[in-house]
Interface confidence: medium
């Protein structure tokens, strides 16, 4: 049975600033055919037929659900892209993370401007701070890492706060054990 394809993002963030670029790639098993990929944005078929969909100079209307399909194989699970205009944007490697998997958070400044005195918060409580911008890296996520995250920082000497982001860590599905 052919596997469902999977949409990946490069850079890996599904929350980006207006004007930024992101490439969505449709990955699957043995899909070597050229021009055989269908892309759907908010349910509408895109003109793009390559296995990569490039979003250049992102606009607000690029926000929404993306799915891909190879030949007549099932559609991929949806990936949701959000385009923002703000001073700070908290980006996550994933908003739903399997327990034991890594989680990366990034406090991203508008136009890639330097952000100083970056403080990450979880459920309203400061997690960690740095004088310069710094990503937070959680090597093995646990259910306790679930929560509402945001960051604050200085851009051009003024203090800003990102919109909150909900992160959910789900338990890995338990393997079935069969009695011999």
């Amino acid at each position: 049975v052919p596997q469902k394809p999977k949409v990946s993002l490069n850079p890996p963030w599904n929350r980006i600033f207006k004007g930024e670029n992101v490439t969505l790639t449709c990955n699957g098993n043995n899909f070597f055919e050229v021009s055989s990929t269908k892309w759907f944005h908010n349910g509408s078929l895109s003109e793009e037929t390559n296995s990569s969909l490039n979003i250049v100079n992102a606009k607000f209307e690029d926000s929404g659900e993306y799915k891909c399909q190879h030949q007549q194989v099932n559609e991929s699970e949806p990936v949701y892209l959000e385009v923002f205009s703000d001073w700070l944007l908290l980006q996550a490697s994933a908003e739903v993370v399997m327990e034991g998997q890594p989680l990366f958070l990034r406090c991203h400044g508008w136009r890639n401007w330097d952000v100083y005195k970056v403080i990450y918060y979880k459920d309203g409580e400061a997690l960690k701070y740095w004088y310069e911008n710094h990503n937070i890296s959680i090597t093995n996520a646990t259910v306790e890492d679930s929560g509402t995250y945001y960051c604050t920082g200085k851009v051009w000497q003024l203090d800003y706060e990102s919109e909150p982001l909900n992160i959910t860590v789900i338990k890995a599905p338990r393997e079935k054990y069969w009695l011999q």
């Epitope: 100083y116 005195k117 403080i119 400061a126 997690l127 960690k128 701070y129 740095w130 004088y131 310069e132 000497q157």
Partner: antibody, heavy 119, light 110 residues
Amino acid sequence: EVQLVQSGAEVKKPGESLKISCKGSGYTFTKYWIGWVRQMPGKGLEWMGIIYPGDSDTTYSPSFQGQVTISADKSISTAYLQWSSLKASDTAMYYCAKDNPFTGSFDIWGQGTMVTVSS
Amino acid sequence: QSALTQPRSVSGSPGQSVTISCTGTSNDVGGYTYVSWYQQHPGKAPKLMIYDVSKRPSGVPDRFSGSKSGNTASLTISGLQAEDEADYYCSSYAGSYTWVFGGGTKLTVL
């Protein structure tokens, strides 16, 4: 009251090991970086390194990298500075200091620990 | 990572003003606003007097002021008082979670 209380003065011989401590109270110890500063007799302040007790993330001054080890035990709100083999030139007053991200400075200092290394 | 450069000593009479300079590089003083000044009396721990170049913590008299131009920061003490006699150290963030201190300046109130 926010304070850092350091362990008492030490007199050691060259080659011996030592671990001095800095206990924080009156604030959430795991949430603020703690720095260590050396002051040799009659000399100025030298920044040695810093630790974030929440996850033991540590950064050293190049001058002190490999010479000392900075650690922390968050369960007892204590940071440590240790030597595996002391030298006479380690004779100094050592201060721990709490970093404050809102002032970009070390706002609270321990009283200092005098370490004397002599044969 | 070299120490910031401060004058060895300065002096002034009560009521006068004195300024202590602190020269670094674009990698420390010139590159960040995180410049602090500490006062240290003999046998005591340092005390924060100025942070973020020019801000005073509560309890520090407004006779103490700070400024910065390029790679040089300055501490000015106006209306000198006898209790101001102490050693003064500047400090700057130097990137990648490292700091650097100045060599210290001995202030004598004549």
